[in-house]
Structures are given as C-alpha cells and as structure tokens.
Interface confidence: medium
C-alpha cells in the first residue's frame, strides 16, 4: 500500500511567549490523529516550540510571521 506519512503531534504547549526576534516560521498541527490543535514555531536556532493557537501571543506571532513572509501556511 501507499507509504504512511508520519504525523507530528504536540503534547506539551509552551506557556511563555517567545520574542518575535527569535522566530523563523510556523506550521499548524490540525491532524485528527493528534490530541490537540497546536502551532509549532521554528526558531532561528532551529528549535521547534509547540504553542496554543488560542493564546493571543501565538496569534500575534503567526500574524507577524505571515506579514514577514506571505506564503500560505498549511
């Protein structure tokens, strides 16, 4: 059968806001296979940080990154 694509899930969400100067990009985690919806920020140090998309700082950060590089996010 077709090769299965591995699913990335977030189990622990960061509470503390990450300053924008540290952020490179983000992607949304919406898979029904995951326990919760999340946003994964990639930092300039290539770290992946899971965050809660309902938090204001997360929404603001996504908006900022969208303006910085207006490419559609999955």
């Amino acid at each position: 059968g077709p090769a299965s694509v591995p699913t990335t899930c977030c189990f622990n969400l960061a509470n503390r806001k990450i300053p924008l100067q540290r952020l490179e990009s983000y992607r949304r985690i919406t898979s029904g296979k995951c326990p919760q919806k999340a946003v994964i920020f990639k930092t300039k140090l290539a770290k992946d940080i899971c965050a809660d998309p309902k938090k204001k700082w997360v929404q603001d950060s996504m908006k900022y990154l969208d303006q910085k590089s207006p490419t559609p996010k999955p």
Epitope: A14, N15, R16, K17, I18, P19, L20, Q21, R22, T43, L45, K47, I49, W57, D60, S61, Y64
Partner: antibody, heavy 124, light 107 residues
Framework: QVQLVQSGAEVKKPGASVKVSCKVS????????MHWVRQAPGKGLEWMGG????????IYAQKFQGRVMMTEDTSTDTAFMDLSSLRSEDTAVYYC?????????????????WGQGTTVTVSS | DIQMTQSPSSLSASVGDRVTITCRAS??????LGWYQQKPGKAPKRLIY???SLQSGVPSRFSGSGSGTEFTLTISSLQPEDFATYYC?????????FGPGTKVDIK
Amino acid sequence: QVQLVQSGAEVKKPGASVKVSCKVSGYTLTELSMHWVRQAPGKGLEWMGGFDPEDGETIYAQKFQGRVMMTEDTSTDTAFMDLSSLRSEDTAVYYCATDDMLTPHYLYFGMDVWGQGTTVTVSS
Amino acid sequence: DIQMTQSPSSLSASVGDRVTITCRASQGIRNDLGWYQQKPGKAPKRLIYATSSLQSGVPSRFSGSGSGTEFTLTISSLQPEDFATYYCLQHNTYPFTFGPGTKVDIK
C-alpha cells in the same frame, strides 16, 4: 495587567544567604519570563539573570554563576532569587522584572513591569 | 560580554530644552535595545523598546533611533518630570547589559 510585589528589606551577615521573593498577580507566573536586576547604592543597573523561554531554562550572568539561584513556585505564582556567600559588595536593591504582556510586538525580552525593589544590606 | 557605554554621563538642561543621549554597544546588537528612566528611590520605567518603539503611556516627546552599535534617546522638549537618570539596555546577547546611565539635572 501584570503586577509584581517583592518581599521586605533584609539585613544579612557576610557569608550568609538571602532569598528575595516576587509575587505575581494579573497573570500566572508560568506565562511570564522573570528577570532579576540589582542596583548597588549610587550605582547603575546590573542584570543578574532571567528565564529564557526558548531554552526553557534560567540564564545567569557569569558574575553570579554558582552563587545565585532563581526559582519559581507556580502554586503561589511567586518567583525567588537566592544569593549565597554574601559579601558587602552585594549590598543593593534587588528588582524582579517581567513582561507587561501588552506590548503589541513581542520583540522584546520583558523588563517592562518591575517590582518595588528589595533592599539587601550585608554588614557584619 | 557586550559593553554598553553612554554619553554624556551627566548633563544639565533647562525645561524646554532638546536633550540627546547616546548609547554605544561594543558589537552589533541589531535593534535589540531599550531605554529606561529611573528616579531616586524608584524602580526603572521603560520608555522605549526595540530601539524606537514608544512604550504605551509614555509621552511622545521621547523618541529613540539607531541600529547596530549606535543608539540615541531624544527628549524633544524637556519637562520638569523628566529630570532623572536614563539607562540603555541591550537584550541581543546574554548576559543582557545596561549602560552606565546618564543623569539629567536642572541647569
């Protein structure tokens, strides 16, 4: 809005330790990155250390490494700064400082809201 | 560590004067710089973040500019409540470091 209230003044003998507390209200401590700054009498501001949200750990200034410990009690939303092996040069006002959580672009490491300061006097 | 220097270390000025304070970093810090005002016996208060953004509630007579290694804080028309000590802070690289301060007093 974030508010920080610090513990009262302390007088300590050389060689002793001091633990300064900083109580957070308006937000939970786990949402904030706390920093500690001190100011000796008539002198400037000196950053001692603070929580780095990317690394998820506390970074200490080299000068205080091994002598300072910054901890949190999330059940009471209180941050602590413990300084050991005190000497007279540690006589200073100690401040906790953090994000206001309102700054529209989170470009900045938070030192927008400050506690009222805790005077620590080290004297024999 | 990044060293921050400020000039002048003190200045005397009159109400209505335009005042400029300079802060220099020993290496490039992009725009990762803030300005603080401190009055005797009080905690510092942030005026400017990210080099040029005005902190909410701070009067528009305060402004910041610069990038890289040289930064300025300008008070366009000094008011009686502005007599204080001003510090810059770099938060580009650990350890964060403050400038030594500039004391602004009445001429």
